[in-house]
């Protein structure tokens, strides 16, 4: 038999089909010019010492073949003796090691049989009614077509898939969507109609997310609060990688994730803007405010399942750093500015109250005033802290108000609000003897020691009314009892408390008169 | 030892349909063209229908064209023949047949074939 030609013999080889998984597969005949034909194949397993023939069946009844050596790829004309307009029916064998391997069988009428090319551009995948949908425009001269998909995840092997007849400019394919798990597609087309046309090859993979973006397992910390009024935002544990089949690892366009962080300001409620969304790489500073934390996952089919952490407010107090005075006009605040031209957000909630019920006021940008301190005022009327309870002021500075991980904290402290020097004095004073020349005071703690830092000291006062002499004597704010000693028997005293704070001097208390019994001697 | 067992065959009304086996077993059935021949009394056992390995091309002789069709499944090393509209000349003993598939797949003569069955008897009654 000559090479060029189909050799209608018996192959030079005994029959011994191996049954293996292994061999040719794959086999794609088609016209390439008016006269001349190719069949291509592939070959699984090892190569060396393997001879490749080309078989064909013509429906007369006669069989022939090809030697191609240990090429996967036979060119052969019109006049090789392979009947191009009637149906043929080819296959591979194989012989290697003794015996002989065989491809499936393709069943076509050559002359028919065009190169069908897969999807060859852009894939366009989208979701539709909880099913995949995949989109790409139809290679060039070849509208009319029947199209398959295979696909696979990470655990299980290929499935075939059936996309049905195309016939239009643009080509489309309803797939699964898998809910939690990636998947891998691949495409193929053949001529639509033509019975028994060759198998296009498999397009490059189209890596598919699942419809569920893995939910987000991170954990955070949060730094110390710095000089600055700022504290960083860390990440203690990164998101798990999403795993991904086979011909989808390294680089996997369509299946990444993308986390980002939802911010949430709770604190100054006043302010512009309380949400901010960042990528989840570059972490923020924030405040000392309180905050809500999410981290929100996405694929390219939209959001996933949120992850939510609540960071509570920084509550470390500056005692001094708050100067508060109360005029007949109303109250002024003074504090250390920050620099020019800064928004000063005052939030202000009675204590031991839920942290929903905070106010606050924000302040139009100012510049710090000749003794570099920044300021808010408001009037009586206004009602602002105008009970007299324990507020918790906290102060937020910003040059840029609308971006919310540019806010920092200036100040907490405490305040007592409405007519402190008068709500803070102290009650039920009681003197008892102690000795023949002193007494024991003692008083019900002032509502000022309620807050914390509020109260500076007691002073408590005596007068003997005699002498009209008065004494007054500091007691620290944790203290609500004085012994006074040096008095003299037979004399009538007044004694007072009052209660001071570092900028306010409190009211007096009701004087309680008392008098040291003389002792009368046997 | 190869067998090809034959099944299916019985008595028939004309114009009714049988499916006859064929269970091959003792080889390896992808690498053989099966068919069918049948032989009525007193004449020459004919070709039938015949079918390559993988099943992608098939020849009828003409007198059961559009009446006969021949599958295989090679899964199951089984090869069929459905009988429509039978008519009275189709009795007779339908045996199948296996050869390899060399520089043939089909032979309209016996001499060609490696294997053969026992034989199942069709009657088809007018």
């Known amino acids: 038999c000559r090479t060029s030609e189909c050799c209608f013999q018996d192959p030079p080889y005994p029959d011994a089909d191996s049954g293996s998984a292994s061999g040719p597969r794959d086999l794609r005949c088609y016209r390439i010019s008016s006269d001349r034909y190719e069949c291509s194949w592939q070959y699984e397993g090892p190569t060396a010492g393997v001879s490749h023939f080309l078989r064909c069946c013509l429906s007369s009844g006669r069989c022939c073949y090809f030697a191609a050596g240990s090429a996967t790829r036979l060119q052969f004309s019109d006049q090789a003796g392979v009947s191009v307009l009637y149906t043929v029916t080819l296959w591979v064998e194989s012989w290697a090691r003794n015996q002989t391997e065989k491809s499936p069988e393709v069943t076509l009428q050559l002359y028919n049989s065009v190169k069908y090319e897969p999807p060859l551009g852009d894939i366009k995948v989208s979701k539709l009614a909880g099913q995949l949908r995949m989109e790409w425009e139809t290679p060039d001269n070849q509208v009319g077509a029947e199209v398959q998909f295979r696909h696979r995840t990470p655990s299980s092997p290929w499935k075939l898939g059936d996309c049905g007849p195309q016939d239009d400019d643009t080509e489309s394919c309803l797939c699964p969507l898998e809910m939690n798990v990636a998947q891998e597609f691949q495409l193929r087309r053949r001529q639509l109609g033509s019975q028994g046309s060759s198998w296009s090859k498999w397009s490059s993979p189209v890596c598919v997310p699942p419809e569920n973006p893995p939910q987000p397992q991170v954990r955070f910390s949060v730094e110390q609060l710095g000089q600055d009024g700022r504290r960083r935002l860390t990440l203690k544990e990164q998101p798990t990688q999403l795993e991904l089949p086979e011909g989808c690892q390294g680089l996997a366009p369509g299946t990444e994730v993308t986390y980002r962080l939802q911010l949430h300001m709770l604190s100054c409620p006043c302010k512009a803007k309380a949400t901010r969304t960042l990528h989840l790489g570059k972490m923020p500073y924030l405040s000392g405010a309180a905050y809500n934390v999410a981290v929100i996952s996405s694929n390219q089919f939209g959001p996933g399942l949120n992850q939510t952490w609540h960071i509570p407010a920084d509550t470390h107090t500056e005692p001094v750093a708050l100067n508060i005075s109360v005029g007949t006009n109303g109250t002024t605040m003074y504090w250390p500015a920050r620099a020019q031209s800064m928004t000063y957000c005052i939030e202000w909630q009675p204590v031991g109250q839920d942290g929903g019920l905070a106010t606050c006021s924000l302040t139009a940008p100012q510049d710090p005033d000749p003794a570099g301190m920044a300021t808010y005022s408001w009037s009586r009327e206004s009602g602002a802290m105008g009970q007299e309870k324990c507020y918790y002021i906290t102060i937020f500075a910003s040059a840029h108000p609308e971006k919310l991980t540019l806010w920092s904290t200036v100040l907490s402290t405490y305040h007592f609000g409405g007519n402190a020097s008068a709500a803070g004095t102290p009650h039920h004073v009681s003197v008892k003897n102690h000795s023949l020349d002193s007494v024991s005071v003692d008083w019900a703690p002032s509502l000022l020691s309620t807050c914390p830092g509020v109260l500076k000291e007691y002073v408590v006062r005596c007068r003997d009314e005699d002498s009209k002499q008065v004494s007054e004597h500091p007691v620290q704010p944790t203290e609500t009892q004085v012994t006074l000693s040096g008095l003299r028997a037979g004399v009538a005293y007044t004694v007072q408390v009052r209660a001071d704070t570092a900028w306010l001097r409190g009211v007096w208390s009701q004087p309680q008169r008392f008098s040291i019994e003389v002792q009368v001697s046997d | 030892e190869v067998q090809l067992v034959e099944s299916g065959g019985g008595l028939v009304q004309a114009g009714g349909s049988l499916r006859l086996s064929c269970a091959a077993s003792?080889?390896?059935?992808?690498?053989?063209?099966m068919a069918w021949f049948r032989q009525a009394p007193g004449k020459e056992r004919e070709f039938v229908a015949g079918?390559?390995?993988?099943?992608?091309?098939?020849h009828y002789v003409d007198s059961v064209k559009g009446r006969f069709t021949i599958s295989r499944d090679n899964g199951k090393n089984t090869v069929y023949l459905q009988m429509n509209s039978l008519k009275s000349e189709d009795t007779a003993v339908y045996y199948c047949?296996?050869?390899?598939?060399?520089?043939?797949?089909?032979?309209?003569?016996?001499?060609?074939?490696?294997?053969w069955g026992q034989g199942t008897q069709v009657t088809v009654s007018s």
């Open positions: 047949a296996g050869k390899t598939q060399g520089s043939t797949w089909y032979h309209l003569t016996p001499d060609g074939y490696d294997y």
């Open positions: 003792g080889l390896t059935f992808r690498n053989y063209a």
């Open positions: 079918i390559t390995w993988g099943g992608g091309l098939t």
